[in-house]
């Protein structure tokens, strides 16, 4: 069964900077990745970035840089301009559209006890929606 993993990392040097890493474990070819925060895409979440392997990427504030890391994983850098850090308690979700498997989504957040610079363990919370 395909699986999506999500890691949220706080940068040690800049506490207002976060990076979300997402990956797809399974067969098939990734055709689109959607990253959202506050919940799954289309279910209360706000879209942060869309990555298409053959057309490019699109991102929206506070996303700063979305990029492919491998053929099946991406990273999204976020910049928190506010004094407080809302990202620390936020859920980030990644949805991978894979042919012919369908869409697979998982969400994750920064653990409350995380030290800066340490990434959250890959604890997938699969939302199995084979669209």
């Amino acid at each position: 069964t395909p699986e999506v993993w999500v890691q949220v990392q706080m940068e040690a040097t800049e506490l207002s900077s976060f990076t979300v890493h997402c990956g797809f474990l399974g067969p098939g070819s990734i055709s689109l990745v959607t990253v959202s925060w506050g919940g799954p895409d289309g279910a209360g979440g706000t879209k942060l970035a869309v990555l298409h392997p053959e057309l490019g990427t699109r991102q929206w504030a506070p996303a700063r840089q979305a990029r492919w890391e491998t053929q099946s994983s991406i990273s999204l850098a976020l910049e928190d301009s506010g004094a407080s850090s809302p990202f620390a308690n936020t859920t980030f979700c990644c949805k991978f559209a894979s042919f012919p498997e369908g869409s697979w989504e998982s969400c994750g957040s920064l653990p409350p006890s995380s030290d800066p610079g340490l990434s959250a363990p890959p604890t997938p919370v699969p939302i199995l929606r084979a669209d």
């Epitope: 990555l51 392997p53 053959e54 057309l55 490019g56 990427t57 699109r58 990029r67 492919w68």
Partner: nanobody
């Protein structure tokens, strides 16, 4: 499908300058890597310069200090400012885009001719 349209080529004297432009037509997305390659008569196509949308730049040694690559604000256009042109810079210059940065799908423009001659 991404289409790349180049402009700015032409005939210039040695020591002169040209500015090449390349725009991706009707793309909703930002293209991660864009760049310029060139092919001189009877030679293989070679990298001239590339730039990622995060600003990482790479040049072939022979153009360092003479050519400058840059990107438009929309992240789907790229420019090549060519100064102190030499006869050996004569070639067809091709715009290139690698949307993912992984080489999964690479797009090419139709090419624009640059001739450096007195």
């Amino acid at each position: 499908e991404v289409q790349l349209v180049e402009s700015g080529g032409g005939l210039v004297q040695p020591g002169g300058s040209l500015r090449l432009s390349c725009a991706a037509s009707e793309t909703y997305f930002d293209l991660y890597v864009m760049g310029w390659y060139r092919q001189a008569p009877g030679k293989d196509r070679e990298l001239v310069a590339t730039i990622t949308y995060t600003g990482s730049i790479k040049y072939v040694d022979s153009v360092k200090g003479r050519f400058t690559i840059s990107r438009g604000d929309a992240k789907n256009s790229v420019y090549l400012q060519m100064n102190s042109l030499r006869a050996e810079d004569t070639a067809v210059y091709y715009c290139n885009a690698d949307p993912s940065g992984l080489g999964r799908k690479v797009y090419w423009g139709q090419g624009t001719m640059v001739t450096v001659s007195s």
